[in-house]
């Protein structure tokens, strides 16, 4: 907390500029008008203020906007955003994607901080759903973002947003999350033809039921082992040896290298040895 002191003669700031870096903390408090700061926030980032000086500027904004900053100020916070607490951010109403991008840019290259998580939460809740443009933005900054959401939160993702999802965005998703995302992907990609559809749906197949895998097995999709290993164990177990052979096509030989890992291990134990022998891979049930 900075003490209230009168501004020395001739030091009253008429604009936010580089001369302010030479002001002591108490001088900034006394000589910079909060309303001026709010209207010229975009200049703050170009000035090499110390962290202590930024604390003073934040304090001035907090006094001016006790109920939370307006979006016109939030959009230009720049590095001052790093000074905000989750409690501060919970007071904000951020509706512009440009504002979100500007603040994410400040935190770029770092792990998702509690501040960023709160900001995203406020933004998504304000929009009511995770639309395509938002998802595009969030996954560009944080590829693991989608998989950080709970199945309940994922249920608010409209199928149209699935077009923004890249395979790497799903790398850390668990089966419960893919169970929610898979039907959305099916809906999103349903009008695509054959090979294009399979390329798009492949990353989501960890949420596919047995019936879908059976259908795909008859259509020359040649699923790779990496995809097969991510399938739900309960969806793979009912597949016959012939169905798995058709599903994997030329990649079926890869089963040998994965025979000790799920879901291959559990699937092997379910099969008759005679059927496994038809693969000629030496798999032991």
């Amino acid at each position: 907390e900075v003490e209230k002191t009168a501004c020395p003669s001739g030091k009253k700031a008429r604009e936010i500029d580089e001369s302010l870096i030479f002001y002591k903390k108490w001088e900034l408090e006394a000589c910079v008008d909060a309303a001026l700061l709010a209207t010229q926030m975009d200049r703050v980032n170009a000035i090499p203020f110390t962290y202590e000086q930024l604390d003073v500027l934040k304090h001035k904004l907090d006094e001016l906007y006790p109920q939370g900053y307006p979006e016109s100020v939030i959009q230009h916070l720049g590095y001052l955003f790093l000074k905000m607490s989750p409690e501060d951010i919970r007071k904000w109403n951020v509706t512009s994607l440009e504002t979100l991008k500007a603040l994410l840019e400040v935190n770029k290259g770092h792990e998702m901080s509690p501040q960023v998580a709160t900001l995203i939460d406020r933004f998504v809740k304000g929009r009511g759903q995770l639309d395509k443009d938002t998802l595009d933005t969030l996954t560009a900054f944080y590829p693991g973002y989608l998989c950080s959401l709970s199945p309940e939160e994922l249920s608010s993702v409209p199928p149209s947003s699935i077009w923004a999802v890249r395979p790497q965005d799903l790398d850390t998703c668990d089966p419960r999350q893919l169970d929610v995302l898979y039907p959305k992907a099916r809906l999103a990609f349903q009008n695509m033809n054959g090979s294009e559809y399979f390329v798009k749906i492949q990353s989501f197949l960890g949420g596919a039921p047995t019936e879908d895998l059976k259908a795909l097995s008859q259509q020359n999709v040649s699923m790779d082992l990496a995809t097969f290993m991510k399938l739900r164990t309960d969806a793979v177990l009912p597949l016959t040896v012939a169905e798995v052979q058709k599903l994997l096509g030329p990649h079926v030989e890869g089963l040998k290298a994965e025979e000790r890992h799920r879901p291959v291990r559990d699937w092997i134990l379910r099969q008759r040895q005679d059927d496994l022998d038809t693969l000629g891979l030496g798999l032991q049930g």
Epitope: N191, A215, Q219
Partner: nanobody
Framework: QVQLAESGGGSVQAGGSLRLSCAAS????????MGWFRQAPGKEREGVGS????????NYSESVRGRFTISLDNAKKTLNLQMNSLKPEDTAMYYC?????????????????????WGQGTQVTVSS
Amino acid sequence: QVQLAESGGGSVQAGGSLRLSCAASGNLYNNMCMGWFRQAPGKEREGVGSIYIGGGYTNYSESVRGRFTISLDNAKKTLNLQMNSLKPEDTAMYYCAAIPIALTRAFCAPIVSRYTYWGQGTQVTVSS
């Protein structure tokens, strides 16, 4: 998951008509197929006809072409089979079935082994 329930079966005189319906619950996607199959006593189950949901592409077996018509009411999630000029040899248990994903519409042909979801069936009896 898709659940299928047939209705509309019954007894009819040769030359008469019947309309079978199949109510689907669960998600229906454009790249799904739905089909009608039948099984007469002591015979193998055989295809009657099928429809590719996206675009309504239909496919009929030789024995019913020109007499039977398949249609889909997407809003009601109902598959219909309009059967005209019925013959005694059309007597069978009629089943509705679905393929969850068809990467090409040609895959929708009414081939029993391709269909993974099945209804319980409805009996059709045609007497001479």
